[in-house]
């Protein structure tokens, strides 16, 4: 299928102009190649009318042009002074006319309606409100005012000043007569329907002295806005329906083959299961506008979308709507999503998040998709280090391995951590990818004590047991803070031969703090990695207390118990500023842990890696 996309149908009136926008994948070849607009003939050939190389056919001379916008991957064809002869089938495309990199466009130019002299034309979108102004002379001020609709040769009364309202307009029309001195009355029609389209007649008084004014009401279906997005990318539908529906339930729906509209998401809590984990309806502003974000776009997401407002949370005639036509380009550089990452209860996951490799300096974020209500995605961590309070000690975002990938590590997993998470940046908003964390049966591979109390001024050893399958991995200990996990110095690089052979059931890498200081209190992680690729981690909390008994402490895994409920936090808690994407309302504001500053380090902390039997080994 061609990746070029444009409007399928364009309609206008004689004498008017049209502007036709066509989209293409903005590869360097596409950006520089010829763009064209051609008309399909009976023979099937497509005759060029205008091209980006400056060609304009004789019957377009002086009234048409083609402008390329390579940075956007679009080009625009403008045609003025339309005539009925311009109706027909066209193509906008790239390269040569017969190659197939094109999109079919149907243009229909109709004759403008023949209206009585002095007719006021009102052009309004379906669902909106129109105010028809009806002037009158002083002598007709006390007389009956009325609005009629002309249907063929007859006039049907719509409303009058004697409180008559035509049933077709019930609860959505009112006639206003201003105070004395103002010689004009108005008729306001709300929630316009397509059937309201037509010629109306205002009348004040009767007989030969009556005042009359014609009004032509054109009720338009909203022209769908064309949206061109990459496969696996992200789209945002911004929906502004007006203050009059600010307090009415909102929805986004997709038009199906039966021309009805299936709800995708609404503010009443309904959501299509096909969008699970990858859709958010942002809280609306005071003016009633809202937006819907869909990530991980699929080819089957293509189609016509409508947003609207109605108390039922679904499409109803006569309520305001906005329309989009979504095209999903399969020539995409964005990696597939969602991925599924598996972890075990008590264990950890290291999630590799893709981002646009051209945006290495962008801020990186990770948020938890919550399906309740309209969906939200509160930030959990960002590359500058802010972490939500309840994730203290178990979540970290690392810039490695870089070149289009960053890493998020989450440990101390519970079944509550299962769900969808989004990787995103403050750069290219199309690069929002979804990852699903699944908690599977099994035991964590790394074993550390759950809770350790260290004594000020003494020596502390914390063991971390790992299985043989990790013998070829690098082992490390680090001290967690909300800005990352600072690796602690190790005594030696590279495994010894005995270590590689791994003939024992278990191996050990131990952390030594000597002497223990107040600054050593906090979370420590034991982990394995391959270069900048991080694997499993295990966390242990170290509490520091005053000296009671002399001597050094060795904490054996047998003494492990649960990590403490009360975690010592800095009092300087601040709000996350929602810098993640262009629409800051996407994320709820969440509390974060302020930087605890001091790191364990220097020569006091050392990591010792050895077999269970040989505590004195010196390999990492």
């Amino acid at each position: 299928k061609s990746p070029v996309f444009g409007p399928q149908e364009v309609s206008s009136v004689e004498g008017n102009s049209v502007s036709i926008k066509c989209y293409y994948p903005p590869t360097s070849v596409n950006r520089h190649t010829r763009k064209y607009w051609c008309r399909k003939g009976a023979s099937g050939r497509c005759i060029t009318l205008v091209s980006s190389e400056g060609y304009v056919s004789s019957n377009y001379a002086g009234r048409a042009n083609l402008t390329n916008f390579p940075e956007n991957g679009t080009f625009v064809v403008n045609i003025a002074q339309l005539s009925r002869d311009d109706s027909g089938h066209y193509k906008c495309g790239l390269g040569i006319n017969s190659r197939g990199l094109s999109f079919d466009v149907s243009l229909e130019v109709s004759q403008g309606p023949e209206l009585p002299n002095g007719t006021e034309v009102y052009t309004v979108d379906v669902g909106r409100t129109v105010t028809i102004k009806c002037p009158f002379k002083t002598e007709n001020a006390p007389k009956t005012k009325a609005l009629y609709k002309k249907i063929g040769q007859t006039s049907v009364l719509v409303i009058d000043s004697r409180n008559y309202v035509n049933p077709n307009y019930k609860d959505r029309i009112r006639l206003r007569i201003p105070g004395t001195g103002q010689l004009i009355f108005t008729v306001v029609i709300d929630r316009l329907r397509l059937s309201d389209h037509g010629l109306y007649l205002c009348q004040a008084g009767d007989g030969s002295n009556r005042d009359e004014k014609n009004a032509d009401l054109q009720v338009l279906e909203p022209e769908p806005e064309l949206v061109y997005e990459d496969l696996r990318g992200s789209v945002t539908f911004h929906c502004a329906l007006g203050l009059e529906v600010a307090n009415v339930a909102k929805f986004l729906c997709r038009v199906n083959s039966r021309e009805t509209c299936d709800v995708v998401i609404n503010t009443l809590g309904k959501r299509d299961s096909a969008f699970e984990g990858r859709i958010l309806l942002n809280p609306q502003d005071k003016d009633g506008s809202f937006s819907v974000v869909i990530t991980g776009l699929r080819k089957e997401d293509e189609g016509r979308y409508l947003c609207g407002a109605h108390s039922d949370g679904q499409l109803q005639e006569g309520w305001p709507i906005q329309a989009w036509q979504l095209f999903v380009n399969e020539e995409s550089t964005i990696p597939r999503s969602p991925t599924v990452v598996k972890g075990v209860a008590g264990g950890s996951v290291a999630v590799l998040c893709p981002y646009n490799p051209k945006e290495s300096q962008s801020l990186k974020y990770w948020c938890l998709w919550e399906g309740a209500q309209n969906g939200r995605c509160p930030l959990l961590v960002e590359s500058q280090g802010l972490v939500q309070e309840q994730y203290e000690g178990r979540l970290s975002l690392l810039q490695e391995p870089g070149n289009g990938t960053f890493t998020v590590i989450l440990n101390q997993l519970t079944t509550q951590d299962a769900g969808f998470y989004w990787c995103l940046t403050n750069g290219d908003t199309r690069w929002r990818t979804t990852v699903e964390i699944k908690i599977i049966e099994g035991e964590p591979n790394l074993k550390v004590p759950g809770n350790v109390t260290a004594v000020l001024g003494e020596t502390l050893n914390i063991p971390c047991h790992f299985p043989c399958k990790f013998s070829s991995y690098e082992k490390y200990w680090c001290k967690w803070s909300n800005t990352g996990c600072q690796t602690l110095p190790s005594q030696d690089e590279g495994p010894s031969e005995a270590f590689v052979n791994c003939d024992e059931n278990s191996r050990l890498v131990s952390l030594t703090l000597n002497p223990v200081t107040r600054a050593d209190e906090g979370w420590y992680w034991c982990g394995v990695k391959q270069g900048h690729f991080y694997g499993e981690t295990a966390a242990v909390y170290v509490a520091v207390e005053e000296k009671k008994v002399a001597g050094s402490r060795y904490v054996s895994p047998a003494k492990a118990d649960a990590a403490p409920d009360e975690k010592v936090l800095d009092s300087g808690v601040r709000e996350i500023e929602n810098k993640a994407i262009q629409d800051p309302r996407l994320f709820a504001e969440e509390k974060v842990v302020a930087d605890t500053g001091d790191q364990a380090g220097g020569s006091r902390a050392s990591v010792d890696s050895s077999s269970s039997e040989e505590q004195g080994g010196s390999s990492k």
Epitope: P335, R336, P338, K342, L352, E400, G404, T405, T433, F533
Partner: nanobody, 116 residues
Framework: QVQLVESGGGLVQAGGSLRLSCAAS????????MGWFRQAPGKEREFAAV????????HYADSVKGRFTISRDNAKNTVYLQMNSLKPEDTAVYYC?????????WGQGTQVTVSS
């Protein structure tokens, strides 16, 4: 779900070359980091190489660095391991893995034998 099938193994003389392929089925191949591991008789499965979703970053075990090259073709849903200057100690079953640093999805493996 990702299914992985390795191929390209065989018998080769020391100093020779082989190219292993790992074909993935399942829509999400291109979003995963991919890795190669190997398991010699009587030993634990050990890490050999890893590559990110876009090939932007790679890493190799010290024992294969400079001799092995990992690459991928997302259009073909395939990851490769080019093995040059093979040594007898490279003899092992080679496994392909999706999401190699967590709980990986594994292939069935392909046997590589290097004779001296």
């Amino acid at each position: 779900q990702v299914q992985l099938v390795e191929s390209g193994g065989g018998l080769v003389q020391a100093g020779g070359s082989l190219r292993l392929s790992c074909a993935a089925s399942g829509r999400t191949f291109s979003s995963y980091a991919m890795g190669w591991f190997r398991q010699a008789p009587g030993k634990e499965r050990e890490f050999a190489a890893v590559i990110t979703w876009n090939g932007g970053s790679t890493h190799y075990a010290d024992s294969v660095k400079g001799r092995f090259t990992i690459s991928r073709d997302n259009a073909k849903n395939t990851v490769y391991l080019q093995m040059n200057s093979l040594k007898p100690e490279d003899t092992a079953v080679y496994y392909c893995a999706a999401d190699p640093m967590n709980s990986p999805y594994w292939g069935q493996g392909t046997q590589v034998t290097v004779s001296s």
